[in-house]
Interface confidence: low
């Protein structure tokens, strides 16, 4: 016997209660493919989520994050708080980067300053929470009487990740 449900297009469902008649999806529901026996409930973008694309009878709503948050996961399944430059997100919220680390973005984690001495260079500009150090020529490369603008940054333990 031919399955009449296969004739039901997207935006409808195959209503078994009505002899496999294709019925339109009820409000706030959708079917993105043909031949569906039920329509799916539309996603609601509430709280930290905002609507990027309204639900239609053939496609689910798409959410974004409100200002101050960014999406995580497939189809923006979560919203994660933005932090300021010089901070990273921890379980307890945004925290300033520890001394010797920086983050120049509103997301991501604090990373150690470059260790200029590893390349035989000296620190030209000190690092901050928001900016990495700037390395320059080694003291030996400078003309007599000249010295580097600042002392080298303290070395961090190799392989130490910012906590």
């Amino acid at each position: 016997l031919q399955d009449l449900c296969s004739n039901c297009p997207a935006g409808t469902f195959c209503d078994n209660n009505r002899s496999q008649i294709c019925s339109p999806c009820p409000p706030n529901s959708f079917s993105s493919a043909g031949g569906q026996r039920t329509c799916d409930i539309c996603r609601q973008c509430k709280g930290v989520f905002k609507t990027r694309k309204e639900c239609s009878s053939t496609s689910n709503a798409e959410c974004d994050c409100i200002s101050g948050y960014h999406c995580l996961g497939a189809e923006c399944s979560m919203c994660e708080q933005d932090c300021k430059q010089g901070q990273e997100l921890t379980k307890k919220g945004c925290k300033d980067c520890c001394f010797g680390t920086f983050n120049d973005q509103k997301r991501g984690i604090c990373r150690p300053w470059t260790n200029c001495s590893l390349d035989g260079k000296s620190v030209l500009v000190n690092g901050t929470k928001e900016r990495d150090v700037v390395c320059g020529p080694s003291p030996a490369d400078l003309s007599p009487g000249a010295s580097s603008a600042t002392p080298p940054a303290p070395a961090r333990e190799p392989g130490h990740s910012p906590q």
């Epitope: 921890t90 379980k91 984690i109 990495d132």
Partner: antibody
């Protein structure tokens, strides 16, 4: 749509330098770091370095330190990777990639084959 | 540097069957924010690598839900519930916690 388009394949002689470009479109170029990754035949993917496209500072793998320079031109939404003192070991496909959330590379360029041959 | 070690290096799978790839890191990838900084990528033949999973277990946008990531200490696993023909390629894990970012040696998934 969001994409990174790289320059075409290049053939270089040993000792020469190569520049690979990576043009971004479909997003705000200065909001995301650009990384460079290469894959030599039979080898795993290898991270070379990254540039903060906003302020332009770069960090490099020690493996390439002194040979690689990563720069960007914000007006052209383009990142560049220069590799000098090429040897046959540098024969590889070079990729640029955008760092999205949490350090992950969510968008990749199509790759640029660099051949080093005398 | 953090060393990433994958197993197996080759994985023949029958379409429709599940598959599992392991990745071990030489150091803890857990950040103080509670996330493990471990990504999974698929490098299909003739294409660029594509992001599958980030932060250990979060599926990237557009990635089918047959892909999942799990974590236990320094051991990470990528699971494919039902392998399809389009899943063929080399799978890499990568840690973006510490510079230099490092990749595993890759696992080649092929169809039986």
């Amino acid at each position: 749509q969001v994409q990174l388009v790289q320059s075409g394949a290049d053939v270089k002689k040993p000792g020469a330098s190569v520049r690979v470009s990576c043009k971004a479109s479909g997003y705000t170029f200065t909001s995301y770091p650009i990384h460079w990754v290469r894959q030599a035949p039979g080898h795993r993917l290898e991270w070379m370095g990254w540039s903060n496209a906003g302020i332009g500072n770069a960090k490099y793998s020690q493996e390439f330190q002194g040979r690689v320079t990563i720069t960007r031109d914000t007006s052209a939404s383009t990142a560049y990777m220069d590799l000098s003192s090429l040897t046959s070991e540098d024969l590889a496909v070079y990729y640029c990639a955008r760092e999205g959330v949490a350090g992950a590379f969510d968008i990749w360029g199509q790759g640029t084959m660099v051949t080093v041959s005398a | 540097d953090i060393v990433m070690t994958q197993s197996p290096l080759s994985l023949p799978v029958t379409p429709g069957e599940p598959a599992s790839i392991s990745c071990r890191s030489s150091q803890n990838l857990l950040h103080s924010n509670g996330y493990n900084y471990l990504d999974w990528y698929l490098h299909k033949p003739g294409q660029s690598p594509q992001l599958l999973i980030y932060l250990g277990s979060i599926r990237a946008s557009g990635v089918p839900d047959r892909f999942s990531g799990s974590e236990s200490g320094t051991d990470f696993t990528l699971k494919i519930s039902r392998v399809e023909a389009e899943d063929v390629g080399i799978y890499y894990c990568m840690q973006p916690l510490q510079i230099p970012y490092t990749f595993g040696q890759g696992t080649k998934l092929e169809l039986k």
